[in-house]
């Protein structure tokens, strides 16, 4: 219909025409991890904020149990950003029991699962080598892609370690999708 | 037809809808940066070119003062880039007097003013530590993310250290928001 | 009004409306990538799926030999990542007769090509110098941004060093465009 | 090779309007703006007004503000400035000139590239 | 707006000669200002960008200096071919505005 006078008779029909303020949105942002127990060779999914300060879901997409719910089928643009943060510091809150707070790798992974397939698809990873030299190092990794998801699908947020993930500030660490 | 009820036959009412091309954009590129007095534990703001090579604002999103202008309330994709560079020669132009050009961190925030509201709210934190070897390092950080904005909404980027940024080129160093 | 006709009366004149599900997208992932002869100064582009796994596209946006083309003038959303690996073990797959595989730095430029003029003009460049000290190395860049695009336009990437692509999964290294 | 080629001479009466056209070739057009100079007989050059070819925004002189316009089709690769109601001191040479700008912020750059020039005469 | 002044207004030199043109600026246009040759019945063209930059093609004879305020056009060495009128023009702020030209003619 692109440059022309829009204005149809009775007897034509159109292709579905929406409000752009009626599509499923949402951004969501960190909040502090919960330590989880997660299978060996799959990592854990990050939780989030969906309701305070900037984080919304509207318009259907709703947010439950680490997951953003896709509630119509179309094309979204998904993205994530996650900000890692390691301290050599012995006492520091986020050094994980056990673990060297300086990683070889870190890695950000947005995944899809759908009910009728076992199998998650990971839709877009970040993954960097880490060389810092300092004792406390931080950086983030950014993901954002288009994707053609169906109702029901669902969208989660996986990082290589939870402990290296910086929660402190809900503009360092979020998720977010939308309908285009 | 923002905001006007839109029942073209007197049996329907439909929601408001609009054509894509008069959403308000704006897609800003990076200018040498002026020196500029900023307060102490405030980061300063860029400014930013507008309207010359791949720069441009459209639909009432207008650019004035290191700002974008939101002219409608509405959710928006915001996104930014800054490549950082450092170089470790005395006579290098970007360097700034009195202060070590090899800092411990780079930082950019896209932040929102909004005039009835005295303090700003950052919208996107990239932070990263630096710990580069050589004598010339460079690096972006990019941002991108998805808000609900209010008519009268200011948006600015702020660096942590203005004489870092690299202005050279219009495809490095960017600043944009459209509406959803 | 999603699924619903749309047949307003005769007296009322709208601006052009369309279905957001017809608008040209795509969706490209990364494929292994076939030595290329480049001339000197210029990157060389990389060829990607259209339309196997992730890969989609859509609405006459069409694929072909290394250019994503525009079907329709308009505002876009580009967006690119490019996950760079080094390694220094000599047999290494991806390490490239004599270039060293540790380089200076790794560059990735989203550029597009006018038939009616010879020269091509970058819109975005994520670049970004290496010191990774580890003998294995890798890392992403990230970029994505607006532009007001021409029917006819052909867009590309290009890297510094095609050997450094990670081209092992379709989620590391990835193309998109979509009207907006 | 990169050039602007411009309509040719005009003679109106004093009131009415004229529109001189500007066509590119050998470069992308959607990236320079265009500018329009004339030059009185005699004068020297008087900046009239400029025009993004990339999404239409223009900059008018406050002189001309609400007697000029200027457009662009991209499909064509042409840009075009309107001048309405004509005076005798509107006769000039009006030139169309590209707007370079070399993708960094540290330039502004200048007009590199220019029309021939169009004689506009008015006269009753 | 901001106004450009140029001096002189005309002036008469000879071949081999070193000729300066200066232009004033009402407020400081950073380093936006452009330099223009123009010969009779011909379309300007474009010498030094950005004050001190020379467009392309330009001979090496053309320079320009100055920031802020006050900007200077050099020919080292006049040559018959430069007899013409020069123009500066800041690119600072809209409207773009020119100086009212330096007549440079043969002594």
């Known amino acids: 219909l692109k440059g022309q006078e829009f204005a149809p008779s009775h007897q034509q029909v159109y292709a579905p025409l929406r409000a752009d303020g009626d599509k499923p949105r949402a951004h969501l942002t960190v909040v502090r991890q919960t330590p989880t127990q997660h299978f060996k060779n799959q990592f854990p999914a990050l939780h989030w904020e969906h309701e305070l300060g900037l984080a919304f879901t509207k318009n259907r997409m709703n947010y439950t149990n680490k997951f953003l719910l896709i509630p119509e089928s179309g094309d979204y643009f998904i993205y994530s950003q996650v900000t890692f943060r390691g301290m050599t510091s012995e006492s520091s809150e986020i050094r994980q029991a056990g673990r060297p707070n300086k990683p070889d790798s870190i890695t950000v992974v947005i995944t899809k699962v759908t009910d009728s397939y076992p199998e998650p698809t990971q839709l877009l990873m970040g993954t960097k080598s880490v060389s810092e030299v300092g004792s406390n190092w931080f950086q983030p990794i950014y993901l954002g892609a288009m994707f053609s998801l169906q109702e029901g699908d669902k969208l989660m947020v996986n990082v290589s370690d939870i402990s290296l993930v910086d929660y402190t500030k809900e503009d360092k660490t979020f998720f977010g999708a939308f309908l285009l | 037809l923002k905001g006007q009820e839109f029942a073209p036959s007197h049996q329907q009412v439909y929601a408001p809808l609009r054509a894509d091309g008069d959403k308000p954009r704006a897609h800003l590129t990076v200018v040498r940066q002026t020196p500029t007095q900023h307060f102490k534990n405030q980061f300063p703001a860029l400014h930013w070119e507008h309207e010359l090579g791949l720069a441009f604002t459209k639909n009432r999103m207008n650019y004035t003062n290191k700002f974008l202008l939101i002219p409608e309330s509405g959710d928006y994709f915001i996104y930014s880039q800054v490549t950082f560079r450092g170089m470790t020669s005395e006579s290098s132009e970007i360097r700034q007097a009195g202060r070590p050009n090899k800092p411990d961190s780079i930082t950019v925030v896209i932040t929102k003013v909004t005039d009835s509201y005295p303090e700003p709210t950052q919208l996107l934190m990239g932070t990263k530590s630096v710990s580069e070897v050589g004598s010339n390092w460079f690096q972006p950080i990019y941002l991108g993310a998805m808000f609900s904005l209010q008519e009268g909404d200011k948006l600015m980027v702020n660096v942590s250290d203005i004489s870092l940024v690299d202005y050279t080129k219009e495809d490095k160093t960017f600043f944009g928001a459209f509406l959803l | 009004l999603k699924g619903q006709e749309f047949a307003p009366s005769h007296q009322q004149v709208y601006a052009p409306l369309r279905a957001d599900g017809d608008k040209p997208r795509a969706h490209l992932t990364v494929v292994r990538q076939t030595p290329t002869q480049h001339f000197k100064n210029q990157f060389p582009a990389l060829h990607w799926e259209h339309e196997l796994g992730l890969a989609f596209t859509k609405n006459r946006m069409n694929y072909t030999n290394k250019f994503l083309l525009i079907p329709e003038s308009g505002d876009y959303f580009i967006y690119s990542q490019v996950t760079f690996r080094g390694m220094t073990s000599e047999s290494s797959e991806i390490r490239q007769a004599g270039r060293p595989n540790k380089p200076d730095s790794i560059t990735v430029v989203i550029t597009k090509v006018t038939d009616s003029y010879p020269e091509p003009t970058q819109l975005l460049m994520g670049t970004k110098s290496v010191s990774e000290v580890g003998s294995n190395w890798f890392q992403p860049i990230y970029l994505g941004a607006m532009f007001s695009l021409q029917e006819g336009d052909k867009l590309m990437v290009n890297v510094s060093d095609i050997s450094l692509v990670d081209y092992t999964k379709e989620d590391k290294t990835f193309f998109g465009a979509f009207l907006l | 090779q990169v050039q602007l080629v411009q309509s040719g001479a005009e003679v109106k009466k004093p009131g009415a309007s004229v529109k001189v056209s500007c066509k590119a070739s050998?470069?992308?057009?959607?990236?320079?703006?265009i500018s329009w100079v004339r030059q009185a007989p005699g004068q020297g050059l008087e900046w009239m007004g400029w025009?993004?070819?990339?999404?239409?925004?223009?900059h008018y002189a406050r002189m001309l503000q609400g007697r000029v316009t200027m457009t662009t089709d991209t499909s064509t690769r042409t840009a075009y400035m309107e001048l309405r109601s004509l005076r005798s001191d509107d006769t000039a040479v009006y030139y169309c000139?590209?707007?370079?700008?070399?993708?960094?912020?540290?330039?502004?750059?200048?007009?590199?590239?220019w029309g021939q020039g169009t004689t506009v005469t008015v006269s009753s | 707006d901001i106004q450009m002044t140029q001096s002189p207004s005309s002036l008469s030199a000879s071949v081999g000669d070193r000729v300066t043109i200066t232009c004033r600026a009402s407020q400081s246009v950073s380093s936006y200002l452009a330099w223009y040759q123009q010969k009779p019945g011909k379309a300007p063209k474009l010498l030094i960008y950005?004050?001190?930059n020379r467009a392309t093609g330009v001979p090496s004879r053309f320079s320009g200096s100055g920031s802020g305020t006050d900007f200077t056009l050099t020919i080292s060495s006049l040559q018959p071919e430069d007899f013409a009128t020069y123009y500066c023009q800041q690119r600072s702020n809209w409207p773009w505005t020119f100086g009212q030209g330096t007549k440079v003619e043969i002594k």
């Open positions: 000139a590209r707007e370079n700008y070399y993708g960094s912020g540290a330039y502004r750059g200048g007009m590199d590239v």
């Open positions: 950005d004050a001190s």
């Open positions: 050998g470069y992308d057009f959607t990236y320079y703006g």
């Open positions: 025009i993004s070819t990339y999404n239409g925004n223009t």
